[in-house]
Amino acid sequence: EPPTACREKQYLINSQCCSLCQPGQKLVSDCTEFTETECLPCGESEFLDTWNRETHCHQHKYCDPNLGLRVQQKGTAESDTVCTCKEGQHCTSKDCEACAQHTPCIPGFGVMEMATETTDTVCHPCP
């Protein structure tokens, strides 16, 4: 790793190291020789999940019911909302941005693995 000018949880600005804002807070103003970094908590439905120097918090993900989504875990100031799919559907991507109906096994095939919230049914030919 290349050398860094600052400690962990600091950043370099105007040739000085300033403290990063803790998760759940955003940067209002950089530190100076005489003042510390100024941070403010994220607002309702916003979050920042790392030590940061962001001036804006990120919006929580919206679990769109029209896409078959529902809230699995409510977001906090330090974490994003986690979406999952409604009963009978599974996520189509790692980030679960949309859902698809579980695939039924066609005649001549049996269920080898049941579908879950994140995986589709795995079918297997009958012997």
Partner: antibody, heavy 126, light 107 residues
Framework: QVQLVQSGAEVKKPGASVKVSCKAS????????MHWVRQAPGQGLEWMGW????????NYAQKFQGRVTMTRDTSISTAYMELNRLRSDDTAVYYC???????????????????WGQGTLVTVSS | DIQMTQSPSSVSASVGDRVTITCRAS??????LAWYQQKPGKAPNLLIY???TLQSGVPSRFSGSGSGTDFTLTISSLQPEDFATYYC?????????FGGGTKVEIK
């Protein structure tokens, strides 16, 4: 009371490696960065880098990048500095030095060394 | 890297003298500066940090001043135990850098 006790003197051949230990006592080992500073005979002080014993994170001076490795064993409150591919100009006294407490610093890196090990003389000679 | 230049490199003085050592940084370091005393065969000893704060247990005859690029260590009345080498160190950004040292010798 705070103490940093280093391993004994070493004589090494050029191209070899040396590993110096620094055992801390009298304070919470994981609460303070540990730095390594060396001093060649009759010369000034030269900073080598730091390790955060809590996270294991390190930061090495460019000059030693790729040749130095700083590690720690929190179970025995000991920091280590390994220097590889030794040359004759690596002959020096190597010191570990304790920094200010984690979270103390808000502006600047404010790394001031209030406690030092007794030093370990490493002689590199063929 | 920030270069730290100390002057003089050596000074001859007598017990009771006032001794001043200067340290100049190649770029502004605010007040992030420390002074150490080192005696032969020993590890350095922290005297002053943040340019002017006296480390606990250090005699009040030692004082520090300055900010930005120019700093001073003053020993108001030199004592026999003060004959040693003194180093400044910037603590603004990594890599930490030290001055070349000032040896205070007996006149």
């Amino acid at each position: 009371q705070v103490q940093l006790v280093q391993s004994g003197a070493e004589v090494k051949k050029p191209g070899a490696s040396v590993k110096v230990s620094c055992k801390a006592s009298g304070y919470t080992f994981t609460g303070y960065y540990m730095h390594w500073v060396r001093q060649a005979p009759g010369q000034g002080l030269e900073w080598m880098g730091w390790i955060n014993p809590d996270s294991g994170g390190t930061n090495y001076a460019q000059k030693f990048q790729g040749r130095v490795t700083m590690t720690r064993d929190t179970s025995i409150s000991t920091a280590y500095m390994e220097l590889n591919r030794l040359r004759s100009d690596d002959t020096a006294v190597y010191y570990c030095a304790r920094d200010q407490p984690l979270g103390y610093c808000t502006n600047g890196v404010c790394s001031y060394f209030d406690y030092w090990g007794q030093g370990t003389l490493v002689t590199v000679s063929s | 890297d920030i270069q730290m230049t100390q002057s003089p490199s050596s000074v001859s003085a007598s017990v009771g003298d006032r001794v001043t050592i200067t340290c100049r940084a190649s770029q502004g370091i605010y007040s992030w500066l420390a002074w150490y005393q080192q005696k032969p065969g020993k590890a350095p000893n922290l005297l002053i940090y943040t340019a002017s704060t006296l480390q606990s247990g250090v005699p009040s005859r030692f004082s520090g001043s300055g900010s930005g690029t120019d700093f001073t260590l003053t020993i108001s009345s030199l004592q026999p135990e003060d004959f040693a080498t003194y180093y400044c160190q910037q603590a603004n950004i990594f890599p930490l850098t030290f001055g070349g040292g000032t040896k205070v010798e007996i006149k």
